[in-house]
């Protein structure tokens, strides 16, 4: 006899990264006549939902608009169909951005290299702070972590044509609350014709993840589908 | 921009009731959650009830069946009904809101609030 009903789906939209007084919506998806969703934070109750009519609704959307620190953290949720209770949903890793400070970011030797030379990003942030993040724009919000008291460097090694891109970097204060994203500085790798001309524009970061969060944060536009990423969440783990 | 005013405490016995009302201004009250959370003597800020824009309740079990949340959006109101007053209920209550929200959301976390009133004190003495 089945104690527990399946695990729902959880994400943010438009995007698990928030600018700070922004509005965010965490959505956590499970079936069809579940009469209760609840939404956990950091291991207490954040929010309940009952949908009307619950054999129609499998989706309950809870907003948040007004995003903090106090709110930045990992969010649950579970539902229930009559007396039966869900396993939780994987963990929503939700940060708050736009805290505190700007970064600066720059890479040696320069924004144009040769395939093959060594790369490094330099992320420098002069307020308390001893976590930095190296995003990329592509398909998976690639997201690398740095350390150092000011400035952290992110070795890319030997590169490819595959390290193209447009790259950003935060400070961290912890795990839930950056700074202000920098100014994006683009890599542009130059290699053999043969092999340019067969590399892929990377494709590592979804064309309109970066794009609604940019939305989010100078217009506070919000678009009503999912963007979860599950490379950026399982990398602040 | 809302404003709560709380206002309805004051002091009753063991075993009374009270009636707590908290007026928001402006025309935002029909398009928010509501809730009343308190804070006794030395101790933290804790959720009592809470209600949505469809009036959904949800309480905590220490005042289940003895407090009852309710709203008037014609009068911009809320209401906490209160009776079997035990001591243990001797806090100031404050009342909260998040605006806006989605129709069935009721918040329990205190995070969740965006604005919040100052306050009526409700004493359960003999």
């Known amino acids: 006899q089945q104690q527990t009903l399946p695990k729902p789906f959880i994400w943010a939209e438009p995007h698990f990264m928030v600018p700070k007084e922004k509005q965010v919506t965490i959505c956590c998806q499970g079936n069809y006549g579940a009469v209760e969703y609840q939404l956990h934070f950091e291991g207490s109750l954040f929010a309940v939902d009952r949908p009307k009519p619950p054999e129609r609704i499998n989706k309950v959307k809870f907003y948040i608009p007004d995003m903090n620190s106090r709110m930045a953290g990992q969010y649950s949720c579970i539902y229930r169909v009559g007396e039966l209770w869900s396993e939780p949903s994987n963990l929503l890793d939700l940060v708050v951005t736009e805290m505190y400070d700007t970064p600066t970011l720059s890479v040696h030797p320069g924004p144009e290299v040769i395939s093959g030379e060594k790369v490094t990003f330099y992320c420098r942030l002069d307020t308390a702070t001893s976590m930095f993040l190296l995003l990329k724009e592509g398909r998976s919000s690639h997201v690398q972590r740095g350390y150092g008291k000011v400035q952290a460097e992110f070795p890319l090694g030997p590169v490819t044509t595959a390290h193209r891109g447009t790259y950003r970097c935060f400070g961290s204060y912890n795990n839930h609350a950056w700074s202000f994203p920098s100014e994006p500085v683009k890599l542009l790798v130059t290699g053999d014709i043969e092999n340019t001309s067969l590399a892929p524009e990377d494709p590592t970061f979804p064309a309109d993840t970066w794009g609604t969060y940019l939305l989010t944060t100078e217009t506070g536009l919000q678009k009503d589908h999912a963007l979860w990423d599950h490379t950026a969440q399982n990398l602040l783990r | 921009e809302v404003q709560l005013v709380e206002s309805g405490g004051g002091e009753v016995q063991p075993g009374g009731s009270l009636r707590l009302s908290c007026a928001a201004s402006?025309?935002?009250?029909?398009?928010?959650?509501m809730g009343w959370f308190r804070q006794a003597p030395g101790k933290g800020r804790e959720f009592v009830a809470a209600?949505?824009?469809?009036?959904?309740?949800y309480y905590a079990e220490s005042v289940k069946g003895r407090f009852t949340i309710s709203r008037d959006n014609a009068k911009n109101t809320l209401y906490l009904q209160m009776s079997s007053l035990r001591a243990e209920d001797t806090a100031v209550y404050y009342c909260a809101a998040v605006v806006p929200t989605y129709g069935n959301n009721i918040y329990v976390h205190s995070a969740a609030y965006n604005y919040w009133g100052q306050g009526t004190l409700v004493t359960v003495k003999p």
């Open positions: 209600i949505s824009r469809s009036d959904d309740t």
């Open positions: 402006g025309r935002t009250f029909a398009s928010a959650a």
